[in-house]
């Protein structure tokens, strides 16, 4: 028998200094969590440690942090590079900066395989990017090879900047060939490292005729088998077991995201290349784990250009900026508007003639919008400053809804309004009228919604049974704010960008802004 | 090999803006600070601010922040310093040089252009 | 911002002689095991080259006369044996904190 340790981060997302329990700014070192230091010193002990050791990442690296708006992807292959990771799939983010921000800090700075067999470059960049990226590697392990497959959500354009020269094809589809190759060069080991989310890693460790082991990302999917060691709650077991079309047990994989663990699998082969056992479990990287001195004076001399960033002008604003919690808890506030804006405009995408996007629609919780920004300071709009607005670090993702469900959010908005709770919503793409005479649950009296399969958008009415697209922050996707029907009812959920970055970005593109108050939502005569 | 190449000399007059570009070839022109700096005749080297292409982000020396713009353009992989309302003490030669602070030289200007002479 | 106080502002010495320049900064510009303190030639009419960086790293293709040591806010500049090429003007850089700001220069002379 010949045993194989893989050890595997996914979903990092910028995060490249340690931070809180939440993954937020570390503020309290002593309580704080993963980086790349830390995680450098736990590889280290493992390499150490153990004969057949290899260091994955299954995508989405980029986007999450002000490293990743600096420095646009050279941090992440300088660090990885420092880390000597074996393996990386491409995740959807890989592309938010379209395929030069993809090739140029990345795809030629690298120096490990970036793989992914579902992408499949036409016209003039395929011979561009050729060999930059690849379907599989052999990876010498020791006195083995072991075949390495990537694949990427196929979702990846309606997610990020990927162009019009990529295909992203179905994933089963262009694994299989790829695998067969890799049996047909006597490579009897096999792991599918990919970026399509837990449910696609179940069907790959089914579908796929040849694949021993799936390590996957997209979906932050927390596994684990017996106590877990901070907040996050199993989805399963680790390593969660998938019986195969062809009767063979393979362990599924994947360590939540962020940095915080690092996933941590044994795996014995026996001399055939197949999976005899499979145990594990993620390491929870705390400060009980010392943060390597050497990675760790890398990143402060890094971070020497970041500090100046925040207080540099993006752009300028001609009007008050009311981020007030008496405005945006109680009625439409220009700076919801201007947030909701933001993030339907970081989500254009022209995909598809009928659609003049895929998204129209916009929510967002009054009580997470934190600060106004006075116009007076010259107009300026630094960084910092939305940094006050937007502070707890999140993300603006894109859900799928069923009308029903955005019925019941709305309703949910208004149920004890008047009492300064963070739960009314802010909207962009939706026009929704409250009477407060009603009784709570039955308060939204006319809800239209603009439509996207339309050349001209136009306000229509909701309708109960349509599936919608929205987006909406990470929070409310998870329940926040008492939004439990969200998180119970959503048909799908997909991780976006950095708040701030989102909002920064725009600012930056528009160059002067002058949000109104313009009618989004409004209270019907007599009870407002 | 790292290759620096700056435009021409300049003479502007006062009032008037002047605008030195620097073309990089040799390595990963996204991926390094490009950093601008001046020297007046007999006298030493001052750093105006420099840029990181790969985002456009930009730090500039107080002295000269409401006077100076530093840009690049990724797709002929040049940067550009432009200063405006000239003066004569604005006379100097301008540098712009590679930083190769993001490996192990840390932020010191490791690959020089040849220099723009301006004067005002 | 950090000031920089070079001396001597000028030397004049030998072929062969040992030659010394200081450098003080303002502030420390040490941290997490770094000094980040650099040192450029700069001959008449020329750009200037790198010739240590991080205070003691010698960059690639530099005579190994030349050498720097400090931490802190007190740096060294070393030529063990002066040679006539070595005629210019030395400057420190530091880099801990923006602006990053030079020296004013030291001029050495071969007698």
């Known amino acids: 028998a010949w045993e194989l340790t893989i050890l595997h981060t996914n979903d990092v997302h910028s995060r490249l200094e340690q931070t809180s329990e939440d993954s937020s700014k570390c503020v309290n070192a002593s309580r704080c969590m993963g980086g790349v230091a830390r995680l450098f010193t736990k590889v280290q002990q493992i390499r150490r440690a153990e004969p057949n050791v290899l260091l994955l990442d299954a995508g989405d690296q980029y986007q999450g942090t002000i490293w990743f708006t600096v420095y646009k992807g050279a941090e992440v292959a300088h660090f990885m590079n420092a880390l000597r990771y074996d393996a990386m799939a491409l995740g959807n983010h890989e592309f938010d900066n379209g395929v030069e921000g993809l090739i140029e800090p990345l795809l030629k700075e690298a120096k490990f395989p970036i793989l992914s067999a579902n992408i499949k470059a036409k016209g003039p960049l395929a011979s561009q990017i050729s060999g930059l990226y690849l379907p599989y590697k052999v990876l010498p392990v020791g006195d083995e090879v072991v075949g390495i497959v990537g694949y990427t959500s196929k979702e990846t354009p309606f997610l990020s900047n990927p162009g019009t020269n990529l295909v992203f094809e179905d994933e089963i589809t262009a694994l299989q060939p790829e695998v067969d190759k890799l049996k047909t060069l006597n490579v009897n080991k096999i792991i599918a490292l990919g970026h399509s989310g837990f449910e696609m890693d179940k069907l790959i460790a089914q579908k796929v005729r040849g694949v021993d082991v799936v390590v996957g990302g997209h979906s932050n999917t927390f596994l684990y088998t017996g106590n877990p060691p901070s907040k996050e709650v199993p989805a399963g077991k680790y390593p969660f077991i998938v019986t195969s079309d062809d009767g063979r047990k393979v362990p599924v994989v994947q360590a939540y995201a962020f940095g915080k663990y690092l996933g941590y699998l044994k795996i014995e082969f026996d001399e055939r290349g197949n999976v005899i056992s499979s145990h594990g479990n993620p390491i929870l990287l705390n400060s009980s784990i010392p943060e390597d001195p050497s990675i760790k004076a890398d990143i402060n001399k890094w971070r020497i250009k970041l500090d100046n960033y925040s207080t540099q002008e993006l752009g300028k604003t001609i009007v008050y900026l009311d981020g007030s919690s008496q405005s945006c808890r109680f009625r439409e506030c220009n700076m919801g508007n201007l947030i909701c804006d933001a993030m339907i405009n970081n989500n254009l995408r022209h995909t598809d003639e009928m659609f003049w996007n895929h998204v129209s629609m916009c929510i967002l919780n009054g009580g997470g919008i934190r600060s106004p920004i006075d116009e007076r300071n010259n107009g300026t709009i630094t960084w910092e400053n939305l940094a006050a607005v937007l502070p707890f670090g999140g993300t603006f993702d894109l859900v799928q809804l069923k009308g029903s469900t955005l019925k019941k959010a709305f309703e949910h908005s208004v149920h004890r309004y008047g009492q300064s709770t963070g739960e009314f919503l802010q909207v962009g793409g939706i026009h929704v009228v409250y009477d407060l005479s009603r009784k709570p649950g039955d308060r939204v009296v006319k809800l239209d919604v603009l439509c996207t399969k339309c050349r001209v958008p136009s306000y229509d009415p909701l309708k109960m049974d349509e599936v919608y697209k929205v987006i909406l922050p990470n929070f409310l996707a998870n329940g926040g704010d008492g939004f439990q029907m969200i998180k119970d009812e959503l048909l799908r959920h997909d991780s976006g960008d950095q708040d701030i970055n989102v909002v920064s970005t725009y600012i930056s593109k528009m160059k002067v802004i002058y949000p109104a108050v313009e009618g989004r939502i409004k209270f019907s005569t007599g009870s407002h | 090999q790292v290759q620096l190449v700056q435009s021409g000399a300049e003479v502007e007059k006062p009032g008037a803006s002047v605008k030195v570009s620097c073309k990089a070839s040799?390595?990963?022109?996204?991926?390094?600070?490009i950093t601008w700096v001046r020297q007046a005749p007999g006298q030493g080297l001052e750093w105006m601010g420099d840029?990181?292409?790969?985002?456009?982000?930009?730090n500039y020396n107080e002295k000269f922040k409401t006077r100076v713009t530093i840009t690049a353009d990724k797709s002929t992989s040049t940067a550009y310093m432009e200063l405006s309302s000239l003066r004569s003490e604005d006379t100097a030669v301008y540098y712009c040089?590679?930083?190769?602070?993001?490996?192990?030289?840390?932020?010191?200007?490791?690959?020089w252009g040849q220099g723009t002479l301006v004067t005002v | 911002a950090i000031q920089l106080t070079q001396s001597p502002s000028s030397l004049s010495a030998s072929v062969g002689d040992r030659v010394t320049i200081t450098c003080r900064a303002s502030?420390?510009?040490?941290?997490?095991?770094?000094?980040?303190m650099h040192w450029y030639q700069q001959k008449p009419g020329q750009a200037p080259r790198l010739l240590i960086y991080?205070?003691?790293n010698l960059e690639s293709g530099v005579p190994s006369r030349f050498s720097g040591s400090g931490s802190g806010t007190d740096f060294t500049f070393t030529i063990s044996s002066l040679e006539a090429e070595d005629a210019a003007t030395y400057y420190c850089?530091?880099?801990?904190?923006?602006?990053?700001?030079f020296g004013q220069g030291t001029k050495v002379e071969i007698k």
């Open positions: 040089a590679k930083e190769g602070g993001l490996t192990t030289e840390d932020y010191a200007l490791d690959y």
């Open positions: 040799g390595y990963t022109f996204t991926s390094y600070w």
């Open positions: 840029i990181y292409p790969g985002s456009g982000n930009t």
């Open positions: 502030k420390n510009v040490s941290t997490s095991g770094y000094s980040y």
């Open positions: 991080l205070a003691s």
């Open positions: 850089q530091h880099s801990r904190e923006l602006p990053f700001t």
